[in-house]
Interface confidence: low
Amino acid sequence: YKLVCYYTSWSQYREGDGSCFPDALDRFLCTHIIYSFANISNDHIDTWEWNDVTLYGMLNTLKNRNPNLKTLLSVGGWNFGSQRFSKIASNTQSRRTFIKSVPPFLRTHGFDGLDLAWLYPGRRDKQHFTTLIKEMKAEFIKEAQPGKKQLLLSAALSAGKVTIDSSYDIAKISQHLDFISIMTYDFHGAWRGTTGHHSPLFRGQEDASPDRFSNTDYAVGYMLRLGAPASKLVMGIPTFGRSFTLASSETGVGAPISGPGIPGRFTKEAGTLAYYEICDFLRGATVHRILGQQVPYATKGNQWVGYDDQESVKSKVQYLKDRQLAGAMVWALDLDDFQGSFCGQDLRFPLTNAIKDALAAT
């Protein structure tokens, strides 16, 4: 099984024990590590951070001790913006220039492939996204002709039904991608006005959401029905939780909220907590399991957080094995307890290790 793990370059800026550099990563933990994110400037793939080249080097030296490790560079992301991607993909010349710039950039910096993180193609971009993937793959095949190992091509896709329907021609893009990471998290957010888990495995009878689509199981099943081969589908598992501020004394699933939860000490983003911050939060909190959804949430005072723990990730891995998927994807290594100092287990990357162990179990 693949264990595809994202590392985010901006995690270096978190203060104190939250700061994570690629040299803190475990070279034997994941089969693939994806560095997020690269930029595109003047239609050419480019660095984003001032010290990306140094960090690329840090990451790719992990392969010196584990030659089986594959590294990919992810281009795009939330801050890049869908419109910028759209302009490049929809213009034949811009697209060609971008595609041509990728292999030499990846080879120069020691990457094994490219991950496309266009978040998200609009309805009118659907065909252009397919063309971009098809032409990128053709370029990778051509570039590898002189006996080089062919560069890998992957894409991170939304797990939301509405986005899947409008953005992706699943059957076509699947033909050209080496694997697809389905982002089976962020199903539920503060916009709903109630508490709810952002990454439930199943819908569960407890789900207060108005649709049956906001769960991992539906998204995976839907992708398969649309023609994604199970052998290329990698299921996303978050090492972060989504938090809410409760608006009343109700604390269950579907309880009213006044907004996102208070920012974490290190991640400093309202409504989001890294797993290592959740371990801190759990001291003195009340933990519940949403039985049908097979995921936990915890409450403390007026704060509510839905997250994944070692038990829930094992359930998710068993599910992806039953579905015969290609493996698991983790967002993100730097949100797990990468130092092993927060979650009291004397173990670095406890969630990702639990995923790895479950994938290896017979």
Epitope: D211, D217, R225, G292
Partner: antibody
Framework: EVQLVESGGGLVQPGGSLRLSCAAS?????????MCWVRQAPGKGLEWIGC?????????YYADSVKGRFTISKHNSKNTLYLQMTSLRAEDTAVYYC????????????????WGQGTLVTVSS | DIQMTQSPSSLSASVGDRVTITCQAS??????LNWYQQKPGKAPKLLIY???SLASGVPSRFSGSGFGTDFTLTISSLQPEDFATYYC????????????FGGGTKVEIK
């Protein structure tokens, strides 16, 4: 009691049309289920025709043999599922069953938990 | 499309016999295989879902096993009411349901 009752079967000429109904009781036809039609030609095995998600979405799936000729729909207030059949052929002669998937989770894949008693459609001149 | 092949198409057995019916999928379907029993003039009845889970009210003499492409339905001790036709059905994908059912196995009295 949760049950499904089909009706509308009968004799129809080749090229003709027919609409079968499946009345649901004990649960609402706008709840979280897939409803499917399965048929069985005389002395033959079971053949899946198609399914519709009866909740808030509009998922429908059809077997290639009936695609473009058969349409599955629902009427929430009547709590009824329909199978509209057009351009009927002799090989469409069968007992038509209405069946319900098990509901809220795909944890076990899908399976048909609840079946109607069936209604016979005969296509002959 | 996922093709389901059932064997044998018919078998003769006596009350008390152990009966085994097999079902093969043309491609891997994980654990998503269901079994139904049908008696003449009646609708099919769910026996086993997800390869090995017994449906509600089904006697424990019925059991299922298998994963991937090869599956088995076993009746440990055949009873008079078990003489019927048995069908397997893949529960992996609605898209590949052409046709999702096996051809059936008729269990007759020897």
């Amino acid at each position: 009691e949760v049950q499904l009752v089909e009706s509308g079967g009968g004799l129809v000429q080749p090229g003709g049309s027919l609409r079968l109904s499946c009345a649901a009781s004990g649960f609402t036809i706008s709840s979280d289920y897939y409803m499917c039609w399965v048929r069985q030609a005389p002395g033959k095995g079971l053949e899946w025709i198609g399914c519709i998600y009866i909740g808030s979405g509009t998922d429908t799936y059809y077997a290639d043999s009936v695609k473009g000729r058969f349409t599955i729909s629902k009427h929430n207030s009547k709590n009824t599922l329909y199978l509209q059949m057009t351009s009927l052929r002799a090989e469409d002669t069968a007992v038509y069953y209405c069946a319900r998937d098990k509901g809220w989770s795909n944890a076990w894949g899908f399976y048909f938990q609840l079946w109607g008693q069936g209604t016979l459609v005969t296509v002959s001149s | 499309d996922i093709q389901m092949t059932q064997s044998p198409s018919s078998l003769s057995a006596s009350v008390g016999d152990r009966v085994t019916i097999t079902c093969q999928a043309s491609q891997s379907i994980g654990k998503y295989l269901n079994w139904y029993q049908q008696k003449p003039g009646k609708a099919p009845k769910l026996l086993i879902y997800s390869s090995s889970s017994l449906a509600s009210g089904v006697p424990s003499r019925f059991s299922g096993s298998g994963f991937g492409t090869d599956f088995t339905l076993t009746i440990s001790s055949l009873q008079p009411e078990d003489f019927a036709t048995y069908y397997c059905q893949q529960g992996y994908s609605y898209v590949d349901l052409e046709n999702g059912f096996g051809g059936g196995t008729k269990v007759e009295i020897k």
